[in-house]
C-alpha cells in the first residue's frame, strides 16, 4: 500500500496521527472493529500531550481507548509496552470491579469525565477514538 | 501580565500540616493545569502532582500519595497544596508552575515565586 | 519512573564561550522534553520545550535539540547574565521528572 499523508476527511491530525472522535456510543468490541476496519485502532495514549489533545477534544464525556486486559494483562490494542508507558488513572483504578451486577469484572479502560482513565465492563455503549499513524502504509491498493 | 503569586514562608513541626497558596492573574484561570514542584535546600527539582482547574481532577506522584492534597477555588483564581504529616526532609521551597489544557502549547511557561516551608521541632 | 541524567554537572567557561549541556532519559520520551534555567533564590525560567521550541521571549543564543533518549541544550555565545543552573525536565509520563542540574559558573 501507499503511505498516507494526510489525514481522512472529518479526522483530526496531531503530532503524526490522524484522530476520529465518535458521537456516539458502542461497546468496547464494536468500537475496536469500527476503527479497525477503517484502517485505525482504538486511540493509544503514550503522553501527557496526546493524552491532553484527546481530552480537549471529547470534553467531560465517557469514551473507549485502545487499552484492555480481557485477557489477563493490562495491554494496548498496538502492541505499545503498558508498563513502561504513560497512564493517567483516577485513583483507586484500576480495580476490576465485580459489584455492577452485569458478571464478570471491568476489562476496557475509559477517559472519564474529567479526563483521568478507569476500568469499566466492556459491553458499554460509550463514544470512542479511533487513531492511525500518518507515517504508516494504508492498506488501500494504490490508484493505477 | 501573567502572575503567579504564592503565599509567604511558613515554619511548622513535624507531624503537622501546613496549606501553601498560588494565586492566578493575567490569564484564563481554568485554561491550565497548575503543577507543584519542590526544591530541597541546596537540591533539585521535584515534581509533586497537578490538578486540573476546571474539574478539580487530581494526580499526584506516588511519593506524596495520600499525604498531598490539591484543591482550587476557581471564584478568587487560586489553587492550594496541602502537605500533611510533615517531616524535616520536607523543608523545601514550594512552586506551583502552570501547564495549558489545549495543546500545542508552551508547558511550565510560568512559575511562581516559590513559598519556603521550614520544618522544625 | 523515567530517570534523567545530565552532564557535566558543573562546567567553568568564559564569556564569549559556546557551551553544550546534554541530558539523557532512561526510557524514550519523544520530543517532550524542556530545559529550565534557575538563579540562586529564584523560580526556575523555562527556556526550551518540546525538546528544540523556544519559549517565548527567550533569546535565540539558547537552543535545544534532540528526541528520543538524548537531549542537548546549546548556548552559543556566554553572556555573564547565563552563569546559573540548568534542569532538564521530562513530561512525557508521570511523575514528571527533573534531571540533577548542571552549574555553569565562570571560569
Known amino acids: 500500500g501507499s503511505e498516507r499523508t494526510c489525514c481522512p476527511v472529518n479526522w483530526v491530525e496531531h503530532e503524526r496521527s490522524c484522530y476520529w472522535f465518535s458521537r456516539s456510543g458502542k461497546a468496547w468490541a464494536d468500537a475496536d472493529n469500527y476503527c479497525r476496519l477503517e484502517d485505525a485502532h482504538l486511540v493509544v495514549v503514550t503522553s501527557w500531550e496526546e493524552q491532553k489533545f484527546v481530552q480537549h477534544h471529547i470534553g467531560p464525556v465517557n469514551t473507549w481507548m485502545g487499552l484492555h486486559d480481557q485477557n489477563g494483562p493490562w495491554k494496548w490494542v498496538d502492541g505499545t509496552d503498558y508498563e513502561t508507558g504513560f497512564k493517567n488513572w483516577r485513583p483507586e483504578q484500576p480495580d476490576d470491579w465485580y459489584g455492577h451486577g452485569l458478571g464478570g469484572g471491568e476489562d476496557c479502560a475509559h477517559f472519564t469525565d474529567d479526563g483521568r482513565w478507569n476500568d469499566d465492563v466492556c459491553q458499554r455503549p460509550y463514544r470512542w477514538v479511533c487513531e492511525t499513524e500518518l507515517d504508516k502504509a494504508s492498506q488501500e491498493p494504490p490508484l493505477l | 501580565q501573567v502572575q503567579l503569586v504564592q503565599s509567604g514562608a511558613e515554619v511548622k513541626k513535624p507531624g503537622a500540616s501546613v496549606k501553601v497558596s498560588c494565586k492566578a492573574s493575567?490569564?484564563?484561570?481554568?485554561?491550565?493545569?497548575m503543577h507543584w514542584v519542590r526544591q530541597a535546600p541546596g537540591q533539585g527539582l521535584e515534581w509533586m502532582g497537578w490538578?486540573?482547574?476546571?474539574?478539580?481532577?487530581?494526580n499526584y506522584a506516588q511519593t506524596f500519595q495520600g499525604r498531598v492534597t490539591m484543591t482550587r477555588d476557581t471564584s478568587i483564581s487560586t489553587v492550594y497544596m496541602e502537605l500533611s504529616r510533615l517531616r524535616s526532609d520536607d523543608t523545601a521551597v514550594y512552586y506551583c508552575?502552570?501547564?495549558?489544557?489545549?495543546?500545542?502549547?508552551?508547558?511550565?511557561?510560568?512559575w511562581g515565586q516559590g513559598t519556603l516551608v521550614t520544618v522544625s521541632s | 519512573d523515567i530517570q534523567m541524567t545530565q552532564s557535566p554537572s558543573s562546567l567553568s567557561a568564559s564569556v564569549g564561550d559556546r557551551v553544550s549541556i546534554t541530558c539523557r532519559a532512561s526510557?524514550?520520551?519523544?520530543?517532550?522534553l524542556a530545559w529550565f534555567q534557575q538563579k540562586p533564590g529564584k523560580a526556575p525560567k523555562s527556556l526550551i520545550f518540546?525538546?528544540?521550541s523556544l519559549q517565548s521571549g527567550v533569546p535565540s543564543k539558547f537552543s535545544g535539540s534532540g528526541s528520543g533518549t538524548d537531549f542537548t541544550l546549546t548556548i552559543s555565545s556566554l553572556q555573564p547574565e547565563d552563569f546559573a543552573t540548568y534542569y532538564c525536565?521530562?513530561?512525557?509520563?508521570?511523575?514528571?521528572?527533573f534531571g540533577p542540574g548542571t552549574k555553569v559558573d565562570i571560569k
Open positions: 490538578i486540573h482547574p476546571n474539574n478539580g481532577g487530581t
Open positions: 525536565q521530562q513530561y512525557n509520563s508521570f511523575p514528571f521528572t
Open positions: 508552575a502552570r501547564d495549558p489544557v489545549v495543546v500545542p502549547a508552551a508547558p511550565f511557561d510560568y
Open positions: 493575567g490569564y484564563t484561570f481554568t485554561g491550565y493545569y
Open positions: 526510557q524514550g520520551i519523544s520530543k517532550y
Open positions: 518540546a525538546a528544540s
